[in-house]
Amino acid sequence: IWELKKDVYVVELDWYPDAPGEMVVLTCDTPEEDGITWTLDQSSEVLGSGKTLTIQVKEFGDAGQYTCHKGGEVLSHSLLLLHKKEDGIWSTDILKDQKEPKNKTFLRCEAKNYSGRFTCWWLTTISTDLTFSVKSSRGSSDPQGVTCGAATLSAERVRGDNKEYEYSVECQEDSACPAAEESLPIEVMVDAVHKLKYENYTSSFFIRDIIKPDPPKNLQLKPLKNSRQVEVSWEYPDTWSTPHSYFSLTFCVQVQGKSKREKKDRVFTDKTSATVICRKNASISVRAQDRYYSSSWSEWASVPCS
Amino acid sequence: RAVPGGSSPAWTQCQQLSQKLCTLAWSAHPLVGHMDLREEGDEETTNDVPHIQCGDGCDPQGLRDNSQFCLQRIHQGLIFYEKLLGSDIFTGEPSLLPDSPVGQLHASLLGLSQLLQPEGHHWETQQIPSLSPSQPWQRLLLRFKILRSLQAFVAVAARVFAHGAATLSP
């Protein structure tokens, strides 16, 4: 058993049929010694008396808010949550496996630049009695500070018969060094509590591996005289790290017909312009990627050829 | 060349070669073999490798003030990785394919380190750590980790030379 926060405790249980459970001793936070009784949740049934209560925690029915009283007055509370371990593996019932980029990916994170700011998000089908708490650091043995905000519900989607809820959180490394080569990964830890179930999820990454630039901005076409060719030009996104002579991007320019089946013409360039042939009803799209490190491409910025 | 005493390196040549190193490091990575181990092998092998850290002067301001500190750090890393790529980790079982980019990568690391340091002048280099793989699967794991670490190192080096070529070239 360990303390999650004041008066909230997590009991770790090996979860299998006829498992013996864990013996837990609760102590009433009071100077009083006599006449103390214990109850669980809303029930008035007295579970025991005395300053300490010993219980065998085996299942969710044994978890909940234990309260000690004296003469009708509440002295203190202890909320017991359960953390299930099945066949040596902690349960992951609360969050949905996003399966990208690999199985058992519950948290996904992205950064728009090297400033040390990043966003993480996760999915669940649970709509009520759900709380999240997020902590982060760089490195784990001698952790350096990362400050995270509160997790918020950022999207709701309907998936078949189910509703899916997306939560996200923004974090900022306290003393970021954008030009350095990271040697210690960022660690993100999410505590999830649904009713009386506790779970924790972690992700470990380098900012360089979660970089996804915003799409190029000010995408423009300039027809070339007496030609089907056009000059496409664009600019670095505002959110990208500066100076651009140091934090350089590379670009992919694509000409795509109306039909998805039509052959796509693609050009790769380090410049912020390119000359392409504009076909009727086609569109021109440009996306960006770090020039020197193959993290994610940005989403496409697009303009119609006409 | 980064002639001792502080004159400038051939920024444009260094830029071109470092960008080539980036490409080679990424093309070598998936080709060192099928690898599920990399998903789980999360303990850092790279604690002993030279990293370009915050105080090494490789940021734009540091380069403007005195690029020598940064260039020395880059040189140190290049020699270090060149030695690793020539070691038993890459030459032992399982054998790399004959056309593997690792050979080119090895030669390019040496090429860039020589551009930075002419013969006769020696910046101190770092000892290769004893990673002591005894099994082929361990070598394979180390190859992935070393190449991942090299990708990060050469990305920073390439940024340094690109910025130098754009703003510090005579």
Epitope: - | L37, G41, S95, P136, L140, L141
Partner: antibody, heavy 121, light 111 residues
Framework: QVTLKESGPVLVKPTETLTLTCTVS????????ISWVRQPPGKGLEWLGV???????NYNSGIKSRLTISKDNSKSQVVLTMTNMDPVDTARYYC???????????????WGQGTTVTVSS | DIVLTQSPDSLAVSLGQRATINCRAS??????????MHWFQQKPGQPPKLLIY???NLESGIPARFSGSGSRTDFTLTISSLQAEDVAVYYC?????????FGGGTKVEIK
């Protein structure tokens, strides 16, 4: 379909040399390493040695001086030679494929049925 | 050599009940976060069969009632609900250092 089949003498006299051949199919010896493992009657398993994809070998230090493992990739055959046999070498000898280096980390994913070798005069 | 000590030597479990086998190594069998510990099942007259590789990965075709956990020196094989066909001897094996070594085996029977 992956198969490994051991063949060789059933009976060997003390001081003689044992030669066992493992013929494999369904995969190439240039892609997978082969180990030899033995099991004395009613006892546990003992790893003898391995031949890697590139032809290099590692042997169990306890019997290293008596052991040679070689292979012919084109014939898909691996040969175990063990000199100076003794009655304590009586065992079932298995030829075993080591799983893909990058996934299995030394786990042996396919085993032959084994061949029983008795050392007796 | 790395010595692998399995416990218990034998185990009698009722059908449908949980069986747990432990394997302790004389030194760590981890290499940069990868545990080179594997589990095999051997039925009488048959060669061993790979169940779990790298401590916790289920080999394809093996029922999900088998699971493995652990790292460094302490490892566990669990059969969550014992079936009649699970009666066998179970071995752990390390491939972190030469020579590869096996545990002494644990015989699992039905109570």
């Amino acid at each position: 379909q992956v198969t490994l089949k051991e063949s060789g003498p059933v009976l060997v006299k003390p001081t003689e040399t044992l030669t066992l051949t493992c013929t494999v199919s369904g995969f190439s010896l240039t892609q997978y390493a082969i180990s030899w493992v033995r099991q004395p009657p009613g006892k546990g398993l003992e790893w003898l040695g391995v031949i890697w994809t590139g032809g290099g070998t590692n042997y169990n230090s306890g019997i290293k001086s008596r052991l040679t493992i070689s292979k012919d990739n084109s014939k898909s055959q691996v040969v175990l030679t063990m000199t100076n046999m003794d009655p304590v070498d009586t065992a079932r000898y298995y030829c075993v494929r080591e799983g893909d280096y990058g996934s299995y980390a030394g786990a042996m994913d396919y085993w032959g049925q084994g061949t029983t070798v008795t050392v007796s005069s | 050599d790395i010595v692998l000590t399995q416990s218990p030597d034998s185990l009698a479990v009722s059908l449908g009940q949980r069986a747990t086998i432990n394997c302790r190594a004389s030194e760590s069998v981890d290499y940069y976060g990868i545990s080179s510990m594997h589990w095999f099942q051997q039925k009488p007259g048959q060669p061993p069969k790979l169940l779990i590789y790298r401590a916790s990965n289920l080999e394809s075709g093996i029922p999900a009632r088998f699971s493995g956990s652990g790292s460094r020196t302490d490892f566990t094989l669990t059969i969550s609900s014992l079936q009649a066909e699970d009666v066998a001897v179970y071995y752990c094996q390390q491939a972190n250092k030469d020579p590869y070594t096996f545990g002494g085996g644990t015989k699992v029977e039905i109570k």
